[in-house]
Each structure stands twice: as structure tokens, then as C-alpha cells.
Amino acid sequence: SEVEYRAEVGQNAYLPCFYTPAAPGNLVPVCWGKGACPVFECGNVVLRTDERDVNYWTSRYWLNGDFRKGDVSLTIENVTLADSGIYCCRIQIPGIMNDEKFNLKLVIKPAKVTPAPTRQRDFTAAFPRMLTTRGHGPAETQTLGSLPDINLTQISTLANELRDSRLANDLRDSGATIRIG
């Protein structure tokens, strides 16, 4: 049931995750982990925020958005095939087992090799099947690798979830209202 995101080797990958703080500066701890969300906490943590700041991160993993406004989307720099897999965004809402957990699937594809015109003969000899398939897939200029691989029905579903996923303001750590993308 994970939403799938794609990137090419060497690109930066983007895994979206959002919440709406109950009040400006009233942040909720968030952790990102490699692997599906476990019952409690995050496994294999790559980045963590607390009520004030990013308090743990590992190289190549960072938050590009304004996490103080609830944009806790993860950017993974210069991805390799080994970065493929499930990632967990866990929004640690105060209370008992009240966390919001999102499993996002990252698919890394080998980098496209675009032949230089002057080297086409050599390229064809080295990779005889490459050129025969050109034109049958997405345009070579398409760089939407990190956007979700979803259809219009799923987009509609996600939009509905954005609209509907509001938590009451009580309970579990002080109850931020959550909207997750």
C-alpha cells in the first residue's frame, strides 16, 4: 500500500511527508527510517527532529523544506541503487500509540545514457539494443524521476486524505492537526 517514488542513480530523491503544527513553533517530533514503520519508533533512523530542531541526521539525508511549518519531506542526495526500498516517515503525535506512520517506496533506476551525436556509431556498437527502444518510452528530457508514480484516481485519493486527515486538538502529546501528503 506504499506510494511509490522514483529517482535515477545520481539524482536527488524526494520523499514527501507533511503535518500542520497546532500552532506556530509547536512542533511534533518526526523520525525517518529505512525500512517499513515498526510498531514503535523508527528503525534504522536516518534523520530525526524534536520539538525545536533537526537533532540527528546522517550524510546525504536532509530536510529541504521548512520543517518548522510541518514540511518534513526527506531529500536523499546523489542516490545509488542501494537506496531503493521502503522509508518510514513517523510523525510522533503526543499520546498513546497515536503516531501517524507513512511507508514510502523509493525505486532507483539506473541513469539513462544519452548518446552524443558524434559518438553514435561507437555507442550503438557497445549498446546495440539501446537505440532501438528510443522513442517508445518517456521523452529523454523528462526528469520527473522523484515524483510519485500514481494515477489520477490515486491523486484524487491523496487529495481527499489531505482534506480529511485532521486530528482533534487534544490527546497524545498536545495533538497537532495532521495533514499528510
Partner: antibody
Amino acid sequence: EVQLVESGGGLVQPGGSLRLSCAASGYTFTSSDINWVRQAPGKGLVWIGWIFPGDGSTKYTPSLKDQATLSTDLAKNTAYLQMNSLRAEDTAVYFCARGLDYWGQGTLVTVSS
Amino acid sequence: DIQMTQSPSSLSASVGDRVTITCKASQDINSYLGWFQQKPGKAPKTLIYRADRLVDGVPSRFSGSGSGQDYTFTISSLQPEDIATYYCLQYDEFPLTFGQGTKLEIK
């Protein structure tokens, strides 16, 4: 507003089965834990099990593992508790909860001939 | 399984009294302890989580403390609306387990 509404309770014969429903609204159903808890008349709270709708993972209390089955229908934002081989001692109010902070009103199951 | 031993099972107190309930876990539960209030015919309501953190909107006369295996729930000044049964819950590991409950009555 988060809401959980249980249904499906009622009178069941000993040895019978029952499927209880927990309709959730007001939040993203696939992202939050659902727990089931029961309470026999005049007794304390007993945890039955847990399900994460996002991936279908489940956990059960050992004494009910062979009797209870948890599931979800993502299209309906509904969680289910199937109870089999019911006995008189399974008579209780059954609650579902999002995490353990938002609770439904409970539904009474009476096992009697 | 982790056993939760809650005491007393019932207690009677006067309005304005300080009331204390204890819960002892059979092993260290790392402060993953909650306290619930339940009134007759109603669903339980969370008051305290992580041993000492008060849920938003819950009056400050309720408090929790403790660590390791031993935990305490306190009502600093009992009010008539506090008449209910109170339960502790450990959520450090599965299966989750509740205490037996403490029925609180007004003298």
C-alpha cells in the same frame, strides 16, 4: 474530528461467530494504529489486539490468538474484529480505538443460549 | 507477558482529598505507561501518557510519576466529577496489558 463507530454486536449462541466493525473517520485511516479492547460486565479492560491498516500488520494477546482475527477494508475506512468459537466468558463490550486515545462507544456482545 | 499490578482495587475519599493509585510492572517498561479514567457506560479516556505527561485539556490536578517498574497516579484535590474507575496500561511491548483497575468513590 476523529470518530470511531463500532457495530455488529448482539446475542450469539455459544460456539458461534461474530464480526464487529469499526468505522473510522476524521483522519487518514491507513496511517494510524487501531487497537481492540474488551470489557466483561463489571470487569476490567483487556487488550485484544492491534492492526496497522497501512500494511495489515497485526498483533494479538496470546489467550485470544486462535479466536480473534483483525482485518481492515481500506476502501471503507473500516476495521474488523472476527471472533470465533464464542463462549459465555466472551460476553463483553468491545471497543476499537485509534491508537489508544480516541475510542469508539463500544458494542455489546452477549454469548448465551 | 508483562503483568501490571494496580492498587488499591477500590478506595473511598472525600472531596478535596489527595488520592494516590500505584501500578507496578513485572519488568522495566521504560516509562511507557498510561493512565485512563472510565465512567460507567462510557469508553475509557486517556489522562496521562509516558508516565508523567498530561494529555491536553485534562485538569492539572491529575498527575503521574515513576520510572522502571513503579508508577504512581495522583489526584491532588478530589472533585465530585472524578468519581470513576482508573486503569494503568503498559505499552512498552506486546501484548499490551492493563492494571486491574481502581474504583474511586466519594465518602
